[in-house]
């Protein structure tokens, strides 16, 4: 941290490594919950026009796709991977791509992904051909 910048106690707004280098925050699509037309596709764009600076540098990008009898929604947010989201752990938070994984939720089809490259939750991927070993 630069010497002229105050250090504050219990500050989670800044993340530093052992050398004092500072981590920049993630840039994520952040439209909260919106109705979506994304259905039966290998991948979809979020159609979210808001790219926000995540509040805390440890936060990653998250997308949640939900389908029930009435509608389809897509949620885009920043979230701390140390904390559950919709009661699920963000196990893929280090991934550069947002690869959707189905989660068990009664009464709806529920997919969620997380990722840690800029605006990575703008392109959500459902296709099985993408996986964590894919270098792209």
């Amino acid at each position: 941290i630069p010497p002229h910048v105050q250090k504050s106690v219990n500050n989670d707004m800044i993340v530093t490594d052992n050398n004092g280098a500072v981590k920049f925050p993630q840039l994520c699509k952040f439209c909260d919950v919106r109705f979506s037309t994304c259905d039966n596709q290998k991948s979809c764009m979020s159609n979210c026009s808001i790219t926000s600076i995540c509040e805390k540098p440890q936060e990653v990008c998250v997308a949640v796709w939900r389908k029930n009898d009435e509608n389809i929604t897509l949620e885009t947010v920043c979230h701390d991977p140390k904390l559950p989201y919709h009661d699920f752990i963000l196990e893929d938070a280090a991934s550069p791509k947002c690869i959707m994984k189905e989660k068990k939720k009664p009464g709806e089809t529920f997919f969620m992904c997380s990722c840690s490259s800029d605006e990575c939750n703008d392109n959500i991927i459902f296709s099985e051909e993408y996986n964590t070993s894919n270098p792209d």
């Epitope: 941290i1 630069p2 010497p3 910048v5 530093t16 490594d17 050398n19 004092g20 280098a21 500072v22 981590k23 920049f24 840039l27 600076i53 800029d118």
Partner: nanobody
Framework: EVQLLESGGGLVQPGGSLRLSCAAS???????RMWWVRQAPGKGLEWVS?????????YYARSVMGRFTISRDNSKNTLYLQMNSLRAEDTAVYYC?????????????????WGQGTLVTVSS
């Protein structure tokens, strides 16, 4: 020597406006994403806004979206922050900083160079 020099801070009433400037020298300005970061008294850093080196894509924290506008003039090596509809909670020291796009961490403990900051006080 790399230098970032902020200016334009001051005392302003709630609802008022200010324009901050950051004059950059000693590095290739057009290679860096530039940031405005602020620190309120006794609080942590808040990442306010960023702008890409080319194409001028901009990003904002949700707390300032719609009120603040970041811009840059690459011909003058200068970064700006237009702050409108100021609130008491915007009171802080405002710093500019530079980031190599895509790099997650700064190169060193000085945030890959910061300015010294300019104080903005919003009070009636």
């Amino acid at each position: 020597e790399v230098q970032l020099l902020e200016s334009g801070g001051g005392l302003v009433q709630p609802g008022g406006s200010l324009r901050l400037s950051c004059a950059a020298s000693g590095f290739t300005f057009t290679e860096y994403r530039m940031w405005w970061v602020r620190q309120a008294p006794g609080k942590g850093l808040e990442w306010v806004s960023a702008i890409e080196p080319i194409g001028n894509r901009t990003y904002y924290a949700r707390s300032v979206m719609g009120r603040f506008t970041i811009s840059r003039d690459n011909s003058k090596n200068t970064l700006y922050l237009q702050m409108n509809s100021l609130r008491a909670e915007d009171t802080a020291v405002y710093y500019c900083a530079k980031q190599i796009p895509g790099r997650k961490w700064t190169a060193n403990s000085r945030f890959d160079y910061w300015g010294q900051g300019t104080l903005v006080t919003v009070s009636s």
